[in-house]
């Protein structure tokens, strides 16, 4: 059938979802593409149990999540509601800093080395974590 | 055997059109996401758009937003993609994509060039 019941091998199953966290950096657009290639979505935070489980995965480590405004409002990758949803900032975050010389502001969030929430330069090389919902990650046998 | 099979490609001038075809065979088709991809010269592979298995729900990555459009028919198992304003950047092999986590089904691809 087409749902899933278990998480793909290297795939951690939570709360009928699948993570995968990279162990090498990416600019934001590159692990958002990457992720999309799995036929899933950079990781959406949508509760506190949820961020502390990733918390606990990705460890002290900037590591980027699904969420970015880049096109003006921040947004979630998968649609889901910012202003209404779940946020973990560090204080006077987000700040679209444009002190660091590298050109624009700060477009893309990212996990801190305490888990809260920064903005940042899109193309900086952070780790990534990829989601999808259990039952859509599921892959029937091939037929033969 | 699941079987993925590209058509549509060919030369365009820039702000011209094309309507690529993917026939799909060897799985139920209307169970599930299907996507495209393309892999420009001497790049990586890009993730360009996804349909969700009833047609209802569409996804585009921002480069082709606007302009790209997927669609589907489930009775002949085929998958579409649109692709209007097509600009030199869009050049690339077009692959109709079976994606799932931790396992892919692909086709051969169909190239798309743009040029003047």
């Known amino acids: 059938g087409s749902e899933r019941t278990c998480c793909p091998v290297n795939w951690v199953e939570h709360e009928r979802s699948c993570y995968w966290f990279s162990r090498s950096g990416k600019a934001w657009a590159d692990a958002d593409n990457y992720c999309r290639l799995e036929d899933a979505h950079l990781v959406v935070v949508t509760s506190w149990e949820e961020q502390k489980f990733v918390q606990h995965h990705i460890g002290p480590v900037n590591t980027w999540m699904g969420l970015h405004d880049q096109n003006g409002p921040w947004k979630w990758v998968d649609g889901t509601d910012y202003e209404t949803g779940f946020k973990n900032w560090r204080p006077e975050q987000p700040d679209d800093w444009y002190g660091h010389g590298l050109g624009g502001g700060e477009d893309c969030a990212h996990f801190t080395d305490d888990g809260r929430w920064n903005d940042d330069v899109c193309q900086r090389p952070y780790r990534w974590v990829c989601e999808t919902e259990l039952d859509k990650a599921s892959q029937e046998p091939p037929l033969l | 055997e699941v079987q993925l099979l590209e058509s549509g490609g060919g030369l365009v001038r820039p702000g011209g059109s094309l309507r690529l075809s993917c026939a799909a065979s060897?799985?139920?088709?209307?169970?599930?996401?299907m996507s495209w991809v393309r892999q420009a010269p001497g790049k990586g592979l890009e993730w360009v758009s996804s349909?969700?298995?009833?047609?209802?729900?569409?996804y585009y990555a921002d480069s082709v937003k606007g302009r790209f459009t997927i669609s589907r028919d489930n009775s002949k198992n085929t998958l579409y993609l649109q692709m209007n304003s097509l600009r030199a950047e869009d050049t690339a092999v077009y692959y109709c994509?079976?994606?799932?986590?931790?396992?892919?089904?692909w086709g051969q691809g169909t190239l798309v060039t743009v040029s003047s």
């Open positions: 060897g799985f139920t088709f209307s169970a599930y996401r």
């Open positions: 349909i969700g298995k009833d047609g209802n729900v569409t």
């Open positions: 994509a079976k994606l799932r986590a931790g396992f892919d089904y």
